[in-house]
Interface confidence: medium
């Protein structure tokens, strides 16, 4: 185009710029080793380093390991991006009691409203369930027969949440039936928002890949690279993705150029001790304790919660569709294997935290 000649001429003889025919404008030439954050950089701030996959470029221009959501009680909220760490939150059905940078150090199961109470605010990844006294008569907020009983004396606004044992504990929390994988799959559908850092104004090249040259002239596909298994953090540092190499872990989400890998316990197991983006200790998935049934929910922020069975009913903890409790989408592959010892249980009050001993038998957790 002849009309482009004046624009092209403005780049000529200026070693710090080049003319990009695709966008028909003069672009800033990123120095060797730096890569543009957009197709036609205009200034030095439009250039950055590259990191290995699972590392992100931090504020100090260093490649930093994205946190890992590999603990079984965590799910990825936002992915590891070139300029920001992955963010983890408690998995559906749990809330964070002890926060950590870009993650949660300790998750608890949402409380179940005791008899005579109904849910005022459902639990989220950040907050526990809030209960309120049931009004006389049937309330539309009643989620189950228990919640619609007449208020009894001495009811509390919130049942004691069930903790996931910290790394220092040898006991693991009795997990909720319904399948962590199902919950995580539901949650993963909500992880990346359209405006997440990794999807806005970034080159859409394959994660972790880079141009065949440090920065081909006129190319927009230039950014700081990280070694595989590292991702580019917000400050431009390569940050380590977690590894799912242990036999009891499987990869949930891959390590990307701008986000960490996430691991979860393999089918048939549940996480007893969480770790960022992974699980430090997986245990066989137990079945429900006697006198306990579960209420599966399929929303990311509302997972299965322990609940006393309605009067006159028998607990059925078999994760099968004919139960009437399990979601219709439950498939055989999502029916989790159970250690036979876990079924030899005694009745346990639902308000008490339940944990597994090293033998797989439930024990009461003193708190």
């Amino acid at each position: 185009f002849p009309q482009d000649r004046p624009f092209e001429d403005t780049c000529h003889g200026n070693p710090s710029h080049y003319y990009d025919k695709a966008v028909r404008r003069c672009c800033y030439r990123c120095p060797m080793g730096l890569f543009p954050t957009q197709q036609c950089p205009q200034r030095p701030t439009d250039c950055r380093k590259q990191c290995e996959p699972d590392y992100y470029l931090d504020e100090a221009d260093r490649c930093t390991a994205c946190v890992t959501c590999s603990r079984d009680d965590l799910v990825e909220k936002t992915p590891c991006a070139w300029n920001s760490s992955r963010v983890c939150e408690c998995r559906p059905g749990m809330f964070c009691s002890t926060s950590a940078v870009n993650s949660c150090a300790r998750c608890f199961f949402h409380s179940v409203c005791p008899a005579g109470m109904i849910v005022k605010f459902p639990g989220t990844a950040q907050k526990n369930t809030v209960c309120e006294p049931a009004s006389p008569g049937v309330s539309p907020a009643c989620a189950s027969p228990e919640n619609c009983k007449e208020p009894s004396s001495g009811t509390i606004p919130q049942a004691k949440p069930t903790p996931v044992s910290p790394a220092t504990s040898s006991a693991s929390t009795m997990p909720v039936r319904g399948g962590t994988r199902l919950a995580q799959e539901a949650a993963s559908k909500l992880t990346r928002a359209p405006d997440s850092p990794s999807s806005v104004g970034r080159p859409s090249s394959d994660p972790g890949l880079s141009p065949t040259q440090p920065c081909p002239e006129g190319s927009g596909d230039c950014r700081k690279q990280c070694e595989p298994d590292y991702y580019l953090d917000e400050a431009g540092r390569c940050t380590a993705c977690v590894s799912c190499s242990r036999d009891d872990l499987v990869e949930k989400t891959p390590c990307a150029w701008n986000s960490s890998r996430t691991c979860e316990c393999r089918p048939g197991m549940i996480c007893a001790t969480s770790a960022t983006n992974s699980c430090a200790r997986c245990v066989p998935y137990p079945i429900c304790a006697a006198e306990t049934v579960t209420k599966p929910q399929d929303m990311a922020e509302k997972d299965t919660t322990f609940e006393a069975p309605p009067l006159g009913t028998q607990p059925d903890c078999n994760p099968t569709p004919e139960n009437g409790e399990a979601p219709a989408s439950t498939s055989p592959t999502q029916s989790l294997l159970v250690d036979s010892q876990a079924s030899k249980t005694l009745p346990i009050p639902t308000s008490a935290p339940v944990a597994l001993s090293s033998t797989g038998k439930p024990v009461l957790d003193a708190g």
Epitope: E52, T64, A65, V101, P214, Q225, E227, D229, C238
Partner: antibody, heavy 120, light 107 residues
Framework: QVQLQQSGAELAKPGASVKMSCKAS????????MHWVKQRPGQDLEWIGY????????DYNQKFKDKATLTADKSSSTAYMQLSSLTSEDSAVYYC?????????????WGQGTLVTVSA | DIVMTQSHKFMSTSVGDRVSITCKAS??????VAWYQQKPGQSPKLLIY???TRHTGVPDRFTGSGSGTDYSLTISSVQAEDLAVYYC?????????FGSGTKLEIK
């Protein structure tokens, strides 16, 4: 199995340059980034930088930016490190190392090291 | 840069003893810590990564632990062949940095 074979010892004069090699075998050379690590006698380890052999992308520890130059030759599956303007401080064993992606974050594979001695 | 400090240059132990080697990071490294064993005249050998994950083929007497800034490598029952220098390394952020090493001596 993964093997990293480094070139032999180098004796150099102050101000000179040396170029050492690290030949990779047992894996696809372009799939693994190559790291370089320095170890002075009786001292700790220092990360120099790394190169992505598939793209020749390099990133350096700021301390070694003007000292080391990393290159790679895909055809021979060999990574190189050149050290320039040598001083006695550069006398050390230099290792090439790589990771086992997806299963380890530390340096799982190391070359045997190249000893560089700078002496007048 | 992140500084990794190994406060003990030397540790003396006996065969069969349990020993813990410590490492402190100058800032939180989110468990992205590796441990290496280096015997005289040899290249370093990876033992542990992500603070507690044993590398392939590493005997289970080697255990890593820690979080935040404090990490340790424990040998549950020291063997004669464990005589070596042990280095911690943060693989959290570039530039990757190593501790100064702890030499394990057998009494």
């Amino acid at each position: 199995q993964v093997q990293l074979q480094q070139s032999g010892a180098e004796l150099a004069k102050p101000g000179a340059s040396v170029k050492m090699s690290c030949k990779a075998s047992g894996y696809t050379f372009t799939s693994y980034w190559m790291h370089w690590v320095k170890q002075r006698p009786g001292q700790d380890l220092e990360w120099i930088g790394y190169i992505n052999p598939s793209t020749d992308y390099t990133d350096y520890n700021q301390k070694f930016k003007d000292k080391a130059t990393l290159t790679a030759d895909k055809s021979s599956s060999t990574a190189y490190m050149q050290l320039s303007s040598l001083t006695s401080e550069d006398s050390a064993v230099y290792y090439c190392a790589t990771r086992h992606y997806g299963s380890s974050y530390g340096f799982a594979y190391w070359g045997q090291g190249t000893l560089v001695t700078v002496s007048a | 840069d992140i500084v990794m400090t190994q406060s003990h240059k030397f540790m003396s132990t006996s065969v069969g003893d349990r020993v813990s080697i410590t490492c402190k990071a100058s800032q939180d490294v989110s468990t992205a810590v590796a441990w290496y064993q280096q015997k005289p005249g040899q290249s370093p050998k990876l033992l542990i990564y992500w603070a507690s994950t044993r590398h392939t083929g590493v005997p289970d007497r080697f255990t890593g632990s820690g979080s935040g800034t404090d990490y340790s490598l424990t040998i549950s029952s020291v063997q004669a062949e464990d005589l070596a220098v042990y280095y911690c390394q943060q693989h959290y952020r570039t530039p990757f940095t190593f501790g100064s090493g702890t030499k394990l001596e057998i009494k």
